[in-house]
Amino acid sequence: DAEFRHDSGYEVHHQKLVFFAEDVGSNKGAIIGLMVGGVVIA
């Protein structure tokens, strides 16, 4: 059987991003997301 290993050779950086809820709706407060590899995932 073939063995598959994920070894991309580079590090994927992540960064916390914070948005104001009122920019996307009527709520107040902050929305915290996580950007991994250029994509906001949370």
Partner: nanobody
Amino acid sequence: EVQLLESGGGVVQPGGSLRLSCAASGRTFNNYNMGWFRQAPGKGREFVAAVSRSGVSTYYADSVKGRFTISRDNSKNTVYLQMNSLRPEDTALYYCAAAYRGTAINVRRSYSSWGQGTLVTVSS
């Protein structure tokens, strides 16, 4: 875009307080989320605090939470940073900046307009 001018910096003893102001020119002030950043000697520019377009929502860096308060007065096109319980590590050049709505408020690249900065020195 808006033009920004900070004031209120100075020398203060540890434990003291300062209030920074940032006056904005332009009729579109309330279209921008506003933030404060700081840059200590020999270090990078770091996020301090931000306030939403309406002034209702705020967000702070962990290092200043509970000590600093950001606010704005849209009738005066001005944003404020009240700094209490100042520490020597708060010594830095403080910059006011404006970010378009919908952009991440805690990262430098979101901010399209910057002031020239006002120097805060905390020393005994």
